[in-house]
Amino acid sequence: MKVLQEPTCVSDYMSISTCEWKMNGPTNCSTELRLLYQLVFLLSEAHTCIPENNGGAGCVCHLLMDDVVSADNYTLDLWAGQQLLWKGSFKPSEHVKPRAPGNLTVHTNVSDTLLLTWSNPYPPDNYLYNHLTYAVNIWSENDPADFRIYNVTYLEPSLRIAASTLKSGISYRARVRAWAQCYNTTWSEWSPSTKWHNSYREPFEQH
């Protein structure tokens, strides 16, 4: 039994890091393998993660962490019974994938303006709370070419757009994702999408 693709890990910079790897053949990850992880330089115990299968030879492990600070560095040991298959380290602050925003809501009752709001996925005491910026994706269910991205570079989790920038009388969907420039994170996953029917009054033409 050998590791074909070494574990790569990402952290949500809160309480979970996810590590993925591939074995050289079909493996029952949860019965055959264990991923041990331990903080370096701290009075902390070693923890064991039981991996799950992620495709035939793929494994994934969700490491539970007691919060995260920038200096944290973990040793990772991948075991198959008594055999050490791989040894490495992981610094969560250098591999951050933020949590996805939640509670995306489209408010259509503000004159002819669409107000999209969502929730910051972090509590106020988390370092990322004040550092997330967002991308909002809006698309038409009827027309695949009607697909747009709005970059929200301010901290407030909301976006206002004129309803007239979208076609009237058809349904749209929106979703939002987040990233933090300060930690050079990857983008989060997209939030669940929300749907609304776009309608607005055409401006009255004067002759």
Partner: antibody, heavy 116, light 107 residues
Framework: QVQLVESGGDLVRPGGSLRLSCTAS????????MSWIRQAPGKGLEWVSY????????YYADSVKGRFTISRDNAKNSLYLQMNSLRAEDTAVYYC?????????WGQGTTVTVSS | DIQMTQSPSSLSASVGDRVTITCRAS??????LAWFQQKPGKAPKSLIY???SLQRGVPSKFSGSGSGTDFTLTISSLQPEDFATYYC?????????FGQGTKLEIK
């Protein structure tokens, strides 16, 4: 407003013990990492210890490892530092501080003097 | 351990001056650097974190920059209340370490 107040500093003989306390107000202690940072007379700053929210993970500087114990009582909104086997070089102002990366809120400090 | 070296150790300046204090790390620390201000007999006060992010409530005359090993703290227009000792601190790796301090004095 957000405030940290330390107490327990005193004059103690080498080899003696002392327990410092820190009471938080204006925020919920359980939401934050908490730290002790010290400053010897006329000297710079040294990060002594910190404790994470749950209390499960603790960090100590090598200079105090095995002698100092940090703890927290979230119900009392309080942080503690038990200092044993004190040495002359532990003489300093001890600050209670909020944060586990950098300290964004500091107490006014309590003075510990170790001398015979 | 990562050594943090500040320069200059002391600095004389006048009200209205623009001053820059530098901090150098003995090895790369990404952007994991904070700056503090301390006045005699008082606790330090957080000014900057993540090398350039201003702590809430700190005036914008303070700014920080840098990444890797070289960092600067700039005060754009000195006021009487800014004369103090300034410290940098790295939190990239344990043990956390501070610079030796830069004492900013009135000329």
């Amino acid at each position: 407003q957000v405030q940290l107040v330390e107490s327990g500093g005193d004059l103690v003989r080498p080899g003696g013990s002392l327990r410092l306390s820190c009471t938080a107000s204006g925020f919920t202690l359980s939401d934050y990492y908490m730290s002790w940072i010290r400053q010897a007379p006329g000297k710079g700053l040294e990060w002594v210890s910190y404790i994470r929210r749950s209390g499960n993970t603790i960090y100590y500087a090598d200079s105090v490892k095995g002698r100092f114990t940090i703890s927290r009582d979230n119900a009392k909104n309080s942080l503690y530092l038990q200092m044993n086997s004190l040495r002359a070089e532990d003489t300093a102002v001890y600050y209670c501080a909020r944060g586990g990366d950098w300290a964004d809120v500091w107490g006014q400090g309590t003075t510990v003097t170790v001398s015979s | 351990d990562i050594q943090m070296t500040q320069s200059p150790s002391s600095l004389s300046a006048s009200v209205g001056d623009r001053v820059t204090i530098t901090c150098r790390a003995s090895q790369g620390i990404s952007i994991y650097l904070a700056w503090f201000q301390q006045k005699p007999g008082k606790a330090p006060k957080s000014l900057i974190y993540a090398a350039s992010s201003l702590q809430r409530g700190v005036p914008s005359k303070f700014s920080g920059s840098g990444s890797g090993t070289d960092f600067t703290l700039t005060i754009s227009s000195l006021q009487p209340e800014d004369f103090a000792t300034y410290y940098c601190q790295q939190y990239n790796s344990y043990p956390y370490t501070f610079g030796q301090g830069t004492k900013l004095e009135i000329k």
